[in-house]
Every structure is written in structure tokens, then in C-alpha cells.
């Protein structure tokens, strides 16, 4: 009876996500067979989040809307470890929007999920950010510095990275 009600709950939770994520990849969390964490297929997972690399070229606002439709946001990078995981799936000759912008052009950077912007946990390329008109952030590869962030114009189409919390069932 307990297992039956747990299964019903899981099925109703899965139905919530079915519209945008018809397939989920789930793994057992810990030793308890009743706890599973899932990411949409073919998203990748790291710690408590799921990541999707969008290869379509879109403006920053459209990229954020695209992530939002999938129940996600443009990626918020909180640690060096998280960035190291993300870059494993990126192409060196491409640039990807992050969920970081400065719409007022006053160097008040803000993350899309309202995570406080912490200057101590940023990975800007040297000399960046460098232009008040460039109000959106990308991550890209520079041979001299490897992967880092750069400010660019928000209306210029780029690839992007979406991030969402894992689905627990």
C-alpha cells in the first residue's frame, strides 16, 4: 500500500514534466531505493542540477525565454567546480550565454535567479568586463587563459547553457 501510493505520487510528478521533458534519466540517490533524482534526457547532471547546451544561436533575452519554457534558467555558476564540469561539454570555438547581465549598464551584474553576484566567485577573462554597452555575459575559450567570461552585446546571437534543479521523485 505504501509502495503503491509512492508510485502514484511519482507518476503524477512525472506527468508535470512530460510536456517539455518526455524522457527523464534517473539515478538512485544514496542507498534508499525510494529516492531517485532525474534530469531530462539528454541533459547532463552535476550535484543537484541539470544542464543543457543549446546550440541554436539566439539573443540573450530569447535564450533566457527558451530556458524558461523548459523550466530552467540560463546557467548561474556558483563555484569553480561547477564551471569545470560545464566546460567539459562546450566547444572551444563557440561562445555561450550565461545567466548574468547588467541591463542598466552600470556594472551592477545580476544573476537571473537572483543569486547575489559575488565578485570573489567570478571567472572573467583578464581585462573583462570592459564595455558598458556589453551588458550580457558569455563563457568562451581563449588560448592564453582557457575558459572564462566576457561581456558582449545582449542582442548578438550566441549559443547558451540552461540550468535547472534536479527532479526528485
Amino acid at each position: 500500500n505504501f509502495m503503491y501510493s509512492k508510485t502514484v505520487k511519482r507518476l503524477s510528478k512525472l506527468r508535470e514534466y512530460q510536456q517539455y521533458h518526455p524522457s527523464l534519466t534517473c539515478v538512485m540517490e544514496g542507498k534508499d531505493i525510494e529516492d531517485w533524482s532525474c534530469c531530462p534526457t539528454p541533459w547532463t547532471s552535476f550535484q543537484s542540477s541539470c544542464y543543457f547546451i543549446s546550440t541554436g544561436m539566439q539573443s540573450w533575452t530569447k535564450s533566457q525565454k527558451n530556458c524558461s519554457v523548459m523550466g530552467a534558467d540560463l546557467v548561474v555558476i556558483n563555484t569553480r567546480e561547477e564551471q569545470d564540469f560545464i566546460i567539459q561539454n562546450l566547444k572551444r570555438n563557440s561562445s555561450y550565454f550565461l545567466g548574468l547581465s547588467d541591463p542598466g549598464g552600470r556594472r551592477h551584474w545580476q544573476w537571473v535567479d537572483q543569486t547575489p553576484y559575488n565578485e570573489n566567485v567570478t571567472f572573467w577573462h583578464s581585462g573583462e568586463p570592459n564595455n558598458l554597452d556589453e551588458r550580457c555575459a558569455i563563457i568562451n575559450f581563449r588560448s592564453s587563459e582557457e575558459w572564462g567570461w566576457n561581456d558582449i552585446h545582449c542582442h548578438v546571437p550566441q549559443k547558451s547553457i540552461c540550468k535547472m534543479k534536479k527532479i526528485y521523485i
Epitope: K65, P103, G105, N130, H155, P157
Partner: antibody
């Protein structure tokens, strides 16, 4: 007072080339993105190219890509448009316009008087 | 590309009356309360002149007879009351993404 003055227009044969210039004054030219916008006779406005303030970014519509090149010389407060392989449909008044950024986009807050380009045999 | 459709293509208005021009975008040009639609006036033989930026902000030096409104895909430029020297072509423009695009224009004639 902000001023944008275009020059370099004229009559050219199909396949020919022209270089338009825009002399800027009254503002810190190097701090602004700039664009060229054209208007064919009796028609509406069509954006032709954009260059960022730092020269790091240029952009063109498919209709002129590979034929037109936008550039700038911040030391001379000048914007340029090199037009090659000109076609009859490139006939228009060409305006140089200053971009002012607002939130995630921009608008054109100042325009020059325009220079006329006529492509005809 | 985002397509902007203006209507009407032309209209004739008597001085003192209201003129309303609409601009419809093929997709949203708004984001988090910011509407990246702008309006320009162009008189014969002159370059375009900025009237309204970000849907509803009046450019400095533009008379308060001009106003703008709208969000997402539908925007309106209103001139009230119309004066004789408002005879011109009016264009909308979006800048939320490249390429920047303009509407086809609306010609306002004064009766």
C-alpha cells in the same frame, strides 16, 4: 552639439565600388556603437550594418554580407562603409546613425543628413 | 528576423484630432518589463528623428503630444492633438535581437 555628416555617395555602375564616410563630432565617438541605415527612393528604412564601440563586433544583413564592410577610426572620429559589387537595389540614401544602449537593446538617437548612392549603368 | 507590421499605411487627420499608429511584431520584443520598441518621425528630405524609446519614453525635446504604449508584440504611437507640422512618415523599430528591424512606415497627412 552632436553632428554626423556623411559623404562619399555618387553615381556608380553595377559591379562598382564606393566608400562612404561619416564624420562625427560633439560627442565621444569611441564610446558609441554606430550603424548605417539606408532608404531606397520612396521606401522605408533598412538597417545595413553595425559596428561596436570597441570595433570588436560587426554585423550585416544577408542582403549585403560579403559585399559591404563597416569600419571605424576612433582617432579620426570617423565611420566608414566600403561597398563593393554594387547592385541596382543598393540605390538609396545612406544614413549614419549613433546607437544608444538601453537595457538589453538600443535605439538610434542621432542621424546624419544622409548621402545618396545611385547604382545605374 | 522579427517582422514589424505597421498600420495603417497612411492616415489623414484634422488638426486638433488624435492620430493612432500601431506596430505589431512577429514575436515578443519585451523582457522583464522592458519593451524594446522605438518610434521615429521622418519628414520629406530629412533624416529620421527619434520620438519615443523603449515603447513609452519621450525623447528629450519631443513635444508631449507624442506618446507611446504597448508591450510584448503590440505597440501604439499616439499624437494628440495633431498639429500641421506633424505631417511625416512614422516608423517603429525593434532592437531586442539582431538584426534590428523597422516597420514599413505610416504616412500621416494633415487635412
Amino acid at each position: 552639439e552632436v553632428q554626423l555628416v556623411e559623404s562619399g555617395g555618387g553615381l556608380v555602375k553595377p559591379g562598382g565600388s564606393l566608400r562612404l564616410s561619416c564624420a562625427a563630432s560633439g560627442f565621444t565617438f569611441s564610446s558609441y556603437g554606430m550603424s548605417w541605415v539606408r532608404q531606397a527612393p520612396g521606401k522605408g528604412l533598412e538597417w545595413v550594418s553595425t559596428i561596436s564601440s570597441g570595433d570588436s563586433y560587426t554585423y550585416y544583413p544577408d542582403s549585403v554580407k560579403g559585399r559591404f564592410t563597416i569600419s571605424r577610426d576612433n582617432a579620426k572620429n570617423s565611420l566608414y562603409l566600403q561597398m563593393n559589387s554594387l547592385r541596382a537595389e543598393d540605390t538609396a540614401v545612406y544614413y549614419c546613425a549613433r546607437q544608444l544602449y538601453y537595457s538589453y537593446g538600443y535605439y538610434f538617437d542621432y542621424w546624419g543628413q544622409g548621402t545618396t548612392v545611385t547604382v545605374s549603368s | 528576423d522579427i517582422v514589424l507590421t505597421q498600420s495603417p499605411a497612411s492616415l489623414a487627420v484634422s488638426p486638433g484630432q488624435r492620430a493612432t499608429i500601431t506596430c505589431r511584431a512577429s514575436e515578443s520584443v519585451s523582457f522583464h518589463g522592458t519593451h524594446l520598441m522605438h518610434w521615429y518621425q521622418q519628414k520629406p528630405g530629412q533624416p529620421p528623428k527619434l520620438l519615443i524609446y523603449a515603447a513609452s519614453n519621450l525623447e528629450s525635446g519631443v513635444p508631449a503630444r507624442f506618446s507611446g504604449s504597448g508591450s510584448e508584440t503590440d505597440f501604439t504611437l499616439t499624437i494628440n492633438p495633431v498639429e500641421a507640422n506633424d505631417a511625416a512618415n512614422y516608423y517603429c523599430q525593434q532592437s531586442i535581437e539582431d538584426p534590428p528591424t523597422f516597420g514599413g512606415g505610416t504616412k500621416v497627412e494633415i487635412k
